[in-house]
């Protein structure tokens, strides 16, 4: 489990680096952040470390009320501050790892550590 979570953490951070450059990656991270009400890997401040992202910006999917541009010049009270790795990781342990192996699909050359099916399942519960 720890190995899986460590890989998921590394993968999530790697995909954050790709966020501004890859629309497919961006849409998957946006889906995760919106569905799990989280922002960044450890927390929302991870986004300010992404070189090609403006330091006063997080993805709109971090917003509590998602609207176009809501992540620009954000206020902490308007975004989800908790990190996604811990939040999704807890959900994975509870709902997925106990039941089955995590699906591994290609995501920009990286292993995808959470399947669309799992996300869909979370979204409807």
């Amino acid at each position: 489990r720890d190995k899986v979570m460590s890989e998921f953490n590394n993968n999530f951070r790697q995909q954050m680096e790709n966020y501004p450059k890859n629309n497919h990656t961006a849409s998957i991270l946006d889906r995760m952040q919106a569905d799990f009400k989280c922002c960044g890997a450890a927390n929302y401040t991870d986004w300010e470390k992404i070189p090609s992202m403006s330091k006063n910006r997080v993805p709109d999917s971090c917003c509590i009320n998602v609207t176009v541009g809501c992540g620009i010049n954000f206020n902490e009270k308007a975004i989800h501050k908790e990190g996604c790795v811990e939040k999704i990781g807890g959900w994975l342990r509870k709902n997925v790892l106990e039941q089955k192996l995590i699906s591994e699909e290609d995501l920009g050359g990286e292993q995808k550590l959470i399947s669309e099916e799992d996300l869909h399942h979370h979204h409807h519960h």
């Epitope: 927390n43 401040t45 300010e48 403006s54 330091k55 006063n56 910006r57 541009g69 809501c70 620009i72 010049n73 954000f74 206020n75 902490e76 009270k77 308007a78």
Partner: antibody, heavy 119, light 108 residues
Framework: QVQLVESGGGLVKPGGSLRLSCAAS????????MNWIRQAPGKGLEWVSY????????YQADSVKGRFTISRDNAKNSLYLQMNSLRADDTAVYYC????????????WGQGTLVTVSS | DIQMTQSPSSLSASVGDRVTITCRAS??????LNWYQQKPGKAPRLLIY???SLQSGVPSRFSGGGSGTDFTLTISSLQPEDFATYYC??????????FGQGTRLEIK
């Protein structure tokens, strides 16, 4: 009503230090980013530093980086600016400014406190 | 960094005149543009936020327009209390937060 009251300004020699304070009242302090903005005599407005609601994010202008430190005490509804290695070109009125963020602009400003750096 | 350039840097006008001040950003800032008024010895006061929204308590003779890189502040009919210095400021990309150099509005 919203009030921002700065204090701590004064005359200091080059290389010296000062600590500015800003007492906030009339609003929920933790709902806002806070800024220090300065204005040298007869000059325009210059952003100095900002700090996020919780204090997790802090940035300074390049002109003060490594010399000025912004902080806040949310329990005391107070904002601070520790200014070290002061130079003559730091002479200015320093304003404590409330920032709702997004596209709303700086909606409340303190009256300012004058810092004079001179030998 | 995004540079903000105001024009003119000073302007003389009479009571009742219509006055327009312009502000240009070095790159697109969408509508993340604010206008402030400052009178001598006083703190600045927010007039317009989000390029065109009037701040509460500001007279309706003030209006803002534009988006992207070019913005305007218009005073439809100058009043004696409007003679002051006006600044634009962008909040789209920071740090740093940047202001225009100011436009001084004087009585003709």
């Amino acid at each position: 009503q919203v009030q921002l009251v700065e204090s701590g300004g004064g005359l200091v020699k080059p290389g010296g230090s000062l600590r500015l304070s800003c007492a906030a009242s009339g609003f929920t302090f933790t709902d806002y980013f806070m800024n220090w903005i300065r204005q040298a005599p007869g000059k325009g407005l210059e952003w100095v530093s900002y700090i996020s609601n919780s204090g997790a994010i802090k940035y300074q202008a390049d002109s003060v980086k490594g010399r000025f430190t912004i902080s806040r005490d949310n329990a005391k509804n107070s904002l601070y600016l520790q200014m070290n290695s002061l130079r003559a070109d730091d002479t200015a009125v320093y304003y404590c400014v409330r920032d709702p963020r997004s596209y709303y602009g700086f909606d409340y400003w303190g009256q300012g406190t004058l810092v004079t750096v001179s030998s | 960094d995004i540079q903000m350039t105001q024009s003119p840097s000073s302007l003389s006008a009479s009571v009742g005149d219509r006055v327009t001040i312009t502000c240009r950003a070095s790159q697109s800032i969408r509508n993340f543009l604010n206008w402030y008024q400052q009178k001598p010895g006083k703190a600045p006061r927010l007039l317009i936020y989000a390029a065109s929204s009037l701040q509460s308590g500001v007279p309706s003779r003030f209006s803002g327009g534009g988006s992207g890189t070019d913005f305007t502040l218009t005073i439809s009919s100058l009043q004696p209390e409007d003679f002051a210095t006006y600044y634009c400021q962008q909040s789209y990309s920071n740090p740093p937060i940047t202001f225009g150099q100011g436009t001084r509005l004087e009585i003709k």
